[in-house]
């Protein structure tokens, strides 16, 4: 299937101009290669009419151009002074020959249609309303007024001033006068449908002295907007239906032959195929809303329609907007696992892709929640502090420049299962969805810390050890001190355990961390983890409490600090901003109630999460060592 996309059918009128936009995949080769527009002949040959190399055929001389927009990955063919001879089959494409990647476009140029004379002309969109003006002479003021619709043989009554209304216009048609003007009456027809299009006659009076006016009403179907998106990327449908439907339920549906199947609406309906990867966000009081879909699949391609109706379902005679979505399978977004599996008590390291051209963008991780319209409160970000209920068990590691950042979540429980999104404040296409599945653990964890009840005594030396199995032998081991700005890796020194060895003694594989002397600031969460280069693996967490030496103290941690703080399930997730005391630096780009929140977060905090003293200070030594 060709990855080039454009409009399948273009129609115009003699003398007018057209612009045809063709989309191509985002690669350096595509941006620089030849773009062409050719006409298909009966033989199957495609004759170049214009190309980006500067070629312009005789028949297009002075009336056409081709412009490449590499920043948008599109090129546009503009043709002016169209004639009926321009009707035909064309291709827009890329490549050195006209047999390269291409898309078929059919262009139809019609004769100039005449506007009927002595006729009032109205052009309205489906679902809107029209007010028809019907002028008459003063002498017909007392007479009956009416509007009828022309059919083949007769003129079928729509409404008249005696309150007679055609059944198909009941509740939709109103006949009225304005103020004291006795020379014009009006007919308003609401919830226009295709069937309302046609010729009407306004009449005041009867017989030869009657005033008649021809009315031509056109009802327009929306023109689909073309959307070109990469596989695994995201798309936002921006729907603007107008103030008249501001208070109605909104929906997005996908065309399926004759019907339109609702994918999501504001009444809580959601297609299971979109679970975990869709949000609907009302924008304002003017009937505007948006629907965001992430993790695009090839089967998501097709025609979409948004609308509004109290039922949350498509309804004839209500305003709609349409799109045609093309999913380009030659995606720049890397193919990553969409399902990550973990076990209770264990950990997961999730690699989030981002546009490598935007390494300085702010990175976020949010949890998709399906209640209501769906939202995605941010749990952690490069400049957003970790949400309170994830204290000690969630961190984001940014690896600038390589197009990936890692989110680690440990001390897993079954409550953590669900959908999570990786996103940045940069290129919104690079939003990806991960499903986290958490199974009950059936064996001991790979990493184990001793002592389990860790209470260090102020001023003394304290060592904790992290035991790891032989399978992690060749990987880099590390300890880091967790804070709500990340997990700061501690300096380590190898205690010579890495000399080549044929056997691996399961019991002696450990990496230790020593605090010497212990200070009050050392209290907190520490992680032991493994990684290979920039790829993070498993982690385990331990809470180290610090207490002053007391005579006869048994050093038992009174609150069992290693037990994960229980999250109150009743607690409501704040979906529009992280609570003030939790994070002064940055508003939560949460549910994307406002797309701009994500774009602007970079301006809000200059604090750098990655900074921090990695060495020792004030004669204290913080180190970890491997055996």
């Amino acid at each position: 299937k060709s990855p080039i996309f454009g409009p399948q059918e273009v129609s115009s009128i003699e003398g007018d101009s057209v612009s045809i936009t063709c989309y191509y995949p985002d690669t350096s080769v595509n941006r620089h290669t030849r773009k062409y527009w050719c006409r298909q002949g009966a033989s199957g040959m495609c004759t170049t009419l214009i190309s980006s190399n500067g070629y312009l055929s005789k028949e297009y001389s002075g009336r056409a151009n081709l412009i490449n927009f590499p920043e948008n990955n599109t090129f546009v063919i503009n043709i002016e002074q169209l004639t009926q001879d321009d009707t035909g089959s064309y291709k827009c494409g890329l490549g050195t020959s006209n047999r390269g990647l291409s898309f078929d476009v059919s262009l139809e140029v019609s004769q100039v249609p005449e506007l009927p004379s002595d006729t009032h002309v109205y052009t309205k969109d489906i679902g809107r309303n029209v007010t028809i003006e019907c002028p008459f002479k003063r002498e017909n003021a007392p007479s009956k007024k009416s509007l009828c619709k022309k059919t083949n043989q007769s003129c079928e009554l729509v409404i008249d001033s005696t309150e007679k209304v055609n059944p198909s216009y009941i509740g939709r048609a109103k006949l009225f006068m304005k103020g004291t003007d006795l020379t014009v009456f009006y007919v308003n027809i609401s919830h226009l449908t295709h069937n309302d299009a046609g010729l009407y006659i306004c009449q005041a009076g009867e017989g030869p002295s009657a005033d008649k006016k021809n009315v031509d009403l056109q009802v327009l179907a929306p023109e689909p907007e073309l959307l070109y998106k990469d596989l695994r990327s995201s798309v936002t449908f921006e729907c603007d239906l107008g103030r008249e439907v501001a208070n109605e339920a909104k929906y997005l549906c996908r065309m399926n032959k004759e019907t339109c199947d609702v994918i999501i609406n504001t009444l809580g309906k959601r297609d299971p195929d979109f679970e975990g990867r869709i949000l609907i966000t009302p924008k304002d009081d003017n009937g505007r809303f948006s629907v965001l879909i992430t993790g695009l699949r090839k089967e998501d391609a097709g025609h979409y329609q948004c609308g509004a109706h109290s039922s949350g379902l498509p309804q004839e005679g209500w305003p709609i907007q349409t799109w045609q979505l093309f999913v380009n399978e030659e995606s720049t977004i890397p193919n990553r696992r969409s399902v990550v599996k973990g076990v209770t008590g264990g950990s997961v390291a999730i690699a989030c892709p981002y546009n490598p051209k935007e390494s300085s963008s702010l990175k976020y991780w949010c949890r998709w929640e399906g209640d209501g319209n769906g939202h995605c409160p941010v749990l952690v970000g490069t400049q957003a502090q970790v949400q309170e209920e994830y204290e000690g068990r969630l961190a984001l590691f940014d690896q600038p420049g390589n197009g990936t950042y890692t989110v680690i979540l440990n001390q897993l429980t079954t409550e953590d299962a669900g959908f999570y999104w990786c996103l940045t404040n940069g290129d919104s296409r690079w939003r990806t969805t991960i499903e986290l599945q958490v199974a009950e653990a059936t064996r001991e964890p790979n990493l184990e810390v001793t002592p389990q009840n860790a209470t260090a005594v102020l001023g003394e030396t304290f060592t904790v050890s992290c035991h790891y199995p032989c399978k992690f032998y060749s990987q880099e081991k590390y300890w880091c001190k967790w804070s709500n700005k990340g997990c700061h890796i501690l300096p380590s020194h190898d205690e010579g355990a890495r000399q080549s060895s044929v056997s691996c003694d399961q019991s002696s594989q450990l990496v230790s961390m020593t605090l010497n002397p212990v200070s009050k600031e050392d209290e907190g969460w520490y992680w032991c983890g493994v990684k290979q280069g920039q790829t993070y693996g498993e982690t385990t967490a331990i809470y180290i409490a610090v207490e002053e030496r007391t005579r006869g103290s048994s050093h038992v941690n009174p609150t069992d600090a290693n037990a994960r703080a229980k999250v109150a399930l009743e607690e409501e997730v704040v979906d529009s901003s992280i609570s003030e005391k939790e994070n002064k630096a940055i508003p939560n780009p949460g549910p994307f109630a406002n797309e701009r929140e994500i774009q602007n977060v970079g301006d809000q905090a200059q604090e750098n999460r990655a900074s921090g003293d990695a060495g020792s200070a004030d004669g204290q030594s913080r180190s970890s060592s491997s055996k």
Partner: nanobody
Framework: QVQLVESGGGLVQAGGSLRLSCAAS????????VGWFRQAPGKEREFVAA????????VTADPVKGRFTISRDNAKNTVYLQMDSLKPEDAAVYYC????????????????WGQGTLVTVSS
Amino acid sequence: QVQLVESGGGLVQAGGSLRLSCAASGRTLRSYIVGWFRQAPGKEREFVAAVTWSDGRRVTADPVKGRFTISRDNAKNTVYLQMDSLKPEDAAVYYCAVSRGGAYEYSRAYEYWGQGTLVTVSS
């Protein structure tokens, strides 16, 4: 709100040609009728031509039929008036206007207007 800007007017000899442009901004013209009117000094505003944006149906007033052509460019949200075989009586300020519908030959049906462009035809 629709903003309209006319351009292309100027001085031309009788028998010559001019092409006027009317560029619209603020919103799409999809459900509008776009009309050209003209007003010579001391005279009433007179209908010249109109086009329905959606389907390109058009009409030209009798005094200019066969000499003036109205056309549109969807991508540029622009309407043109090609004026050929100009006569001294064509001299006027030419206005572009848009209407949501009604009696397209009457200026009262048009709700948004441009500032006009002057066409002078010397004999």
